[in-house]
Interface confidence: low
């Protein structure tokens, strides 16, 4: 059976296509090609006579067609108008005609697309943005890429207009992009230049750094405020509710206790019209904000009841602190045999009794901090064991 095959079936505009003929009968007078699905003299492209090997152009000939002795037809520099069906008629020697129809599709070489946007400066959580891939062309697939990734599944992303339009519902600061669109047809593909969004947002709640609360007199106070914001936030400082200055940093040299108080950073975004504040308490004091762990020592850790005495000493390098003592979670002294001396650094027990055996520890503190020692174990016995002079806690 006579058949035709288009090579290729999908042709790029400006390229060529060969209508190849298979199973051509023997004993031929000639053949003709027609545009369309049937033989129509008004739409003849070319005729070919075997005897004379002469090709004769028909009414539908454009000058771009070449017919070969094997009946194949080459069409060069194809246009989209060439898309469609082509019919070959073979005139046999017995004057019985055979026909075969083939087709091909011409697609344009796609241009580099571009992205248009209805809003390139959206406000976070408020605006929607619609991107449109230009130009609109027939028989084209539209694809979108965000940050070089295919579109994530998200209820905030919607495709419409045959995927030519990508809408971001309620943009966030993470939606900056870049965005690219790609157009594809069976013969070509092209991707746009990337487009980024300038998402306006913030300010978020500001952060004041450093995080320190306590400062010593004479130190320099240097505070910095930051709030995520686009465009960048404008900052101002208030101390105890009184406006100080409109800067991101606040610097006060050689502070005194009078500089203690409440420090407020105010962040403002003039585009979104939003404001956020953070308050930080600063305390200027001679007292150590962190009291070191004290050390506890005993003159003896094993003593004879009703005979020996013992001295417990609480050591610390911190100044301006107070000391208190504990025995079995009770505050000391708890009897007349216990005496505190040297600003409570020493606890003396004289004489030691059976009920004094157990765990002792000391605690150092000031108005803003405290710390306690590791416990020490006091052993009391009533037989004549040798005394142990030791400093190690139990």
């Amino acid at each position: 059976q006579l058949t035709t095959e288009s090579m290729p079936f999908n042709v790029a505009e400006g390229k060529e296509v060969l209508l190849l003929v298979h199973n051509l009968p023997q004993q031929l007078f000639g053949y003709s090609w027609y545009k369309g699905e049937r033989v129509d003299g008004n739409r003849q492209i070319v005729g070919y006579a075997i005897g004379t090997q002469q090709a004769t152009p028909g009414p539908a000939n454009s000058g771009r067609e070449t017919i070969y002795p094997n009946a194949s037809l080459l069409i060069q520099n194809v246009t989209q108008n060439d898309t469609g069906f082509y019919t070959l008629q073979v005139i046999k020697s017995d004057l019985v005609n055979e026909e075969a129809t083939g087709q091909f599709h011409v697609y344009p070489e796609l241009p580099k697309p571009s992205i248009s946007s209805n809003n390139s400066n959206p406000v976070e959580d408020k605006d929607a943005v619609a991107f449109t891939c230009e130009p609109e062309t027939q028989d084209t697939t539209y694809l979108w890429w965000i940050n070089n990734q295919s579109l994530p599944v998200s209820p905030r992303l919607q495709l419409s207009n045959g995927n030519r339009t990508l809408t971001l519902l309620s943009v966030t600061r993470n939606d900056t992009g870049p965005y690219e669109c790609e157009i594809q047809n069976p013969v070509s593909a092209n991707r746009s230049d990337p487009v980024t969004l300038n998402v306006t947002y913030g300010p978020d709640t500001p952060t004041i750094s450093p995080s320190d609360t306590y400062y010593r007199p004479g130190a320099n106070l240097s505070l910095s405020c930051y709030a995520a914001s686009n465009p960048p936030a404008q900052y101002s400082w208030l101390i105890n509710g009184t406006f100080q200055q409109s800067t991101q940093e606040l610097f006060i040299p050689n502070i005194t206790v009078n500089n203690s108080g409440s420090y407020t950073c105010h962040a403002n975004n003039s585009v979104t019209g939003c404001n956020r504040t953070t308050v930080k308490t600063i305390i200027v004091t001679e007292l150590s904000p962190v009291v070191a762990k004290p050390q506890i020592k005993a003159s003896k850790t094993t003593v004879t009841g009703d005979k020996d005495s013992v001295n417990l000493t609480c050591s610390t390098n911190d100044t301006g602190i107070s000391i208190r003592w504990f025995f079995k979670n009770q505050s000391l002294p708890s009897s007349e045999r216990m005496k505190l001396s040297q600003g409570n650094t020493t606890l003396s027990i004289n004489p030691v009794k059976r009920e004094d055996a157990g765990t002792y520890w000391c605690e150092v503190f000031n108005p803003i901090s405290k710390n306690q020692s590791d416990p020490i174990m006091l052993n009391v016995n009533y037989n004549a064991l040798p005394q142990e002079n030791g400093l190690s806690p139990g």
Epitope: T141, L143, W144, I146, N147, Q149, S150, L151, P152, V153, S154, L159, N163, N174, D175, T176, G177, Q184, N185, P186, S188, A189
Partner: antibody, heavy 120, light 113 residues
Framework: EVQLLESGGGLVQPGGSLRLSCAAS????????LYWVRQAPGKGLEWVAT????????SYADSVKGRFTISRDNSKNTLYLQMNSLRAEDTAMYYC?????????????WGQGTLVTVSS | DIVMTQSPDSLAVSLGERATINCKSS????????????LAWYQQKPGQPPKLLIY???TRESGVPDRFSGSGSGTDFTLTISSLQAEDVAVYYC?????????FGGGTKVEIK
């Protein structure tokens, strides 16, 4: 209901060729990226190839690059895998898969597979 | 290319107990544009094709029981079966779904102890 039906598997000698087909139904075929994934007997899953909605973009695992060609005919709702220069290590169950949504993504729908055996 | 490493290779857990499978990728799967991790988990029972359980590292596919959960970010991910059922015996695979390469982990076989 999404359905993917692979065919074309069989026994082939090393160096030979085979063409797998995957007939799709139950969804708009031309809207989705499609893939081939294979699994050697008793082994794990291996992604083989990806093709974009229009067929203009393809990508391949290094192990098959230059030997296998993925293609599609949107008018026939069919995905193909042309396998040339086959090797013993290509012996596997070949699955046709579809993404959950139109772009390239995870594999939400799988066919039952077609077995390819490369042996002399 | 991204390499996905799963551990352990196999796991035996009593019915009703928790099963935990780990997956590590050779590069971050976190997409900073949308703060989503491009990782999926699949379940494959003998003689069947794989079934999608979880995508974006922690989003359950519709119809998947809530005893399956995914967690992790960047390069380290975990699939947890909170209370193992008999029908959960299968091989589990993690997969990077960053276009254009879709690499699978080597698989973890989960059995009943």
């Amino acid at each position: 209901e999404v359905q993917l039906l692979e065919s074309g598997g069989g026994l082939v000698q090393p160096g030979g060729s085979l063409r797998l087909s995957c007939a799709a139904s139950g969804f708009s075929f031309s809207d989705y990226y499609l893939y081939w994934v294979r699994q050697a007997p008793g082994k794990g899953l291996e992604w083989v190839a990806t093709i974009s909605v229009g067929g203009g973009q393809t990508s391949y695992a290094d192990s098959v690059k230059g030997r296998f060609t993925i293609s599609r005919d949107n008018s026939k709702n069919t995905l193909y895998l042309q396998m040339n220069s086959l090797r013993a290590e290509d012996t596997a169950m070949y699955y046709c898969t579809r993404a959950l949504y139109y772009g390239p993504a995870w594999f939400a729908y799988w066919g039952q597979g077609t077995l390819v055996t490369v042996s002399s | 290319d991204i390499v996905m490493t799963q551990s352990p290779d196999s796991l035996a857990v009593s019915l009703g107990e928790r099963a935990t499978i780990n997956c590590k990728s050779s590069q971050s799967l976190l997409n900073s544009a949308n703060q989503k991790n491009y990782l999926a988990w699949y379940q494959q029972k003998p003689g069947q094709p794989p079934k999608l359980l979880i995508y974006f590292a922690s989003t359950r596919e519709s119809g998947v029981p809530d005893r399956f959960s995914g967690s992790g970010s960047g390069t380290d991910f975990t699939l947890t079966i909170s209370s193992l059922q008999a029908e959960d015996v299968a091989v589990y695979y993690c997969q990077s779904h960053i276009y254009p390469n879709f690499t699978f982990g080597g698989g973890t076989k989960v059995e009943i102890k």
